[in-house]
Interface confidence: low
């Protein structure tokens, strides 16, 4: 059966779509392409003899059309009032015809669309935005995206106007977005430019750092003080109780054992009218701290398989550490049937089989250093099971 | 595709300076710690110097302390070794290297090409 | 005199396994990672091994490596003419900081 295929069916307004013919019959005189959904000779596009392969245009020819001897109409620079149905009518040489309607549908390209906002500087946990984009056009979709991402489902968020404006309640920090609209047809997508929030917020309680307490005399003391906050907080430095400057960074070099003492970080912001402080512990001295090596230690070093559990515990004495758990040189847990625990200190084993069997160690670590335990063997048993009519198990 | 190469390399006299530079692309450069390693002719590998991803912290290996500064700008994606002072046993092909540790578990995972400094008179 | 002790040389016929080994102290290798490099001719050396045994990406499976206390081993199974080159292993000493390189090994692949 002659049939037609629009490619594509849903064509962007300015581009082409080919009409394409399947099952042509093989002994033809010529065809016709007609606009709409019947035979008409008013509005017929071309007509194609097969002998002179001339091509002959119709009333509704607008000279955008091309007819090819497989019978495909080209239609370039395509308008939204192209968009309907087309009709073709093939003249067999045995004079039957047949006749083939398809269609498709011409869109818009749409426009590069723009985010208005009633609020571009709102409060944190007081203030709502109301997001609106623009423009407002017909047989078009609005998306939302959030940080490049879509919208997260959130009793905070809410969508209204057919999507086309998005309503932020009780704004947090971390709504600053960025904030893009996008519209969609089917032939065409156009996302708007970011937009962000300033949203006014903090401090809050900063944070000093590198995070060591323990210094050589002689080094340089670099403390840098960080709180969340917009505008920027203000910050201040007090050393045992006594204002040392106004900046971010308290800088000291050559240390001695006299700068040990309580460093105070004060954070401000000016807006919100809010002041944090944390206290950090420095300690000057010649000793270095080394991490010692962990005892681990075994509920049972002999089980039996398929019955037992057991647990190992990796014992120290440091603190700011992690530890991690190694079996014939793999790393743990490595199976369900393995669980760690309290800060990983404790490995369990339940329950154990005889691939379980072997040497177990744990290492401490920590940005600096690190060691291992002693090794410890688990050695795991099988009960002798009674063979069934003394057939051996094969 | 990250990229590494080194420039400023040639001939010094003993007790004459160089700049070495060392311009980084295809990743963020103010995200790695970078060193400089060198290699004498027909020799093994021997580490310079490291500088932290913001630069705050710099180390130096003992033989070129007080005469090799590290130095880095992150707005250029560029590693830069001011060497004064040379003495003939600097002579070497000079590679600057990344790591993408930050530092706690040092690995260099791509290198310069390298550049030939000659010390000589 | 390198702080990382390595043999000056090793070889092997194609298919072969060959081991190199790396000697440091508690400073270096006893309490950091290691990495293994090797060095083509006239090029700049190559990242093999880190994290004392971690391959990156496009380093095929024939390279291993492992730590044990104070020392290090990089393993090459199914030996081929390419792999002939220097190899160097390194860690980061926390008595001298700094990095430091074993000496080098030179490959050399045999017949």
């Known amino acids: 059966q002659l049939t037609t295929e629009s490619m594509p069916f849903n064509v962007a307004e300015g581009k082409e779509v080919l009409l394409l013919v399947h099952n042509l019959p093989q002994q033809l005189f010529g065809y016709s392409w007609y606009k709409g959904e019947r035979v008409d000779g008013n509005r017929q596009i071309v007509g194609y003899a097969i002998g002179t392969q001339q091509a002959t245009p119709g009333p509704a020819n607008s000279g955008r059309e091309t007819i090819y001897p497989n019978a495909s109409l080209l239609i370039q620079n395509v308008t939204q009032n192209d968009t309907g149905f087309y009709t073709l009518q093939v003249i067999k040489s045995d004079l039957v015809n047949e006749e083939a309607t398809g269609q498709f549908h011409v869109y818009p390209e749409l426009p590069k669309p723009s985010i208005s906002s009633n609020n571009s500087n709102p409060v944190e946990d007081k203030d709502a935005v109301a997001f609106t984009c623009e423009p407002e056009t017909q047989d078009t979709t609005y998306l939302w995206w959030i940080n490049n991402q879509s919208l997260p489902v959130s009793p905070r968020l809410q969508l209204s106007n057919g999507n086309r404006t998005l309503t932020l309640l009780s704004v947090t920090r971390n709504d600053t977005g960025p904030y893009e609209c996008e519209i969609q047809n089917p032939v065409s997508a156009n996302r708007s430019d970011p937009v962000t929030l300033n949203v006014t917020y903090g401090p809050d309680t900063p944070t000093i750092s590198p995070s060591d307490t323990y210094y050589r005399p002689g080094a340089n003391l670099s403390l840098s003080c960080y709180a969340a906050s917009n505008p920027p907080a203000q910050y201040s430095w007090l050393i045992n109780g006594t204002f040392q400057q106004s900046t971010q960074e308290l800088f000291i070099p050559n240390i001695t054992v006299n700068n040990s003492g309580s460093y105070t970080c004060h954070a401000n912001n000016s807006v919100t009218g809010c002041n944090r402080t944390t206290v950090k512990t420095i300690i000057v001295t010649e000793l270095s701290p080394v991490v010692a090596k962990p005892q681990i230690k075994a509920s049972k070093t002999t089980v039996t398989g398929d019955k037992d559990s057991v647990n190992l515990t990796c014992s120290t004495n440091d603190t700011g550490i992690s530890i991690r758990w190694f079996f014939k040189n793999q790393s743990l847990p490595s199976s369900e049937r393995m669980k760690l625990s309290q800060g990983n200190t404790t490995l369990s084993i339940n329950p154990v089989k005889r691939e379980d069997a072997g040497t177990y160690w744990c290492e401490v670590f920590n940005p600096i250093s690190k060691n291992q335990s002693d090794p410890i063997m688990l050695n795991v048993n099988y009960n002798a099971l009674p063979q069934e009519n003394g057939l051996s198990p094969g | 595709e990250v990229q590494l190469l080194e420039s400023g390399g040639g001939l010094v006299q003993p007790g004459g300076s160089l700049r070495l530079s060392c311009a980084a692309s295809g990743f963020n450069f103010s995200n790695y710690a970078m060193s400089w390693v060198r290699q004498a002719p027909g020799k093994g590998l021997e580490w310079v110097s490291v500088i932290s991803h913001g630069g705050g912290s710099i180390y130096y290996a003992d033989s070129v302390k007080g005469r090799l500064t590290i130095s880095r700008d992150n707005s250029k994606n560029t590693l830069y070794l001011q060497m004064n002072s040379l003495r003939a046993e600097d002579t070497a092909v000079y590679y600057c290297?990344?790591?993408?540790?930050?530092?706690?578990?040092?690995?260099?995972?791509?290198w310069g090409q390298g550049t030939l400094v000659t010390v000589s008179s | 005199q390198s702080v990382l002790t390595q043999p000056p040389s090793a070889s092997g016929t194609p298919g072969q396994r060959v081991t190199i080994s790396c000697s440091g102290s508690s400073s270096n290798i006893g309490n950091n990672y290691v990495s293994w490099y090797q060095q083509l001719p006239g090029t700049a050396p190559k990242l093999l091994i880190y994290?004392?045994?971690r391959r990156p990406s496009g380093v095929p499976d024939r390279f291993s490596g492992s730590k044990s206390g104070t020392s290090a081993s990089l393993a090459i199974s199914g030996l081929r003419s390419e792999d002939e080159a220097d190899y160097y292993c390194g860690a980061w000493d926390l008595s001298l900081n700094g990095y430091v390189f074993g000496g080098g090994t030179k490959l050399t692949v045999l017949g």
């Open positions: 994290a004392d045994s």
């Open positions: 290297a990344r790591d993408p540790t930050k530092g706690y578990a040092p690995t260099f995972d791509y």
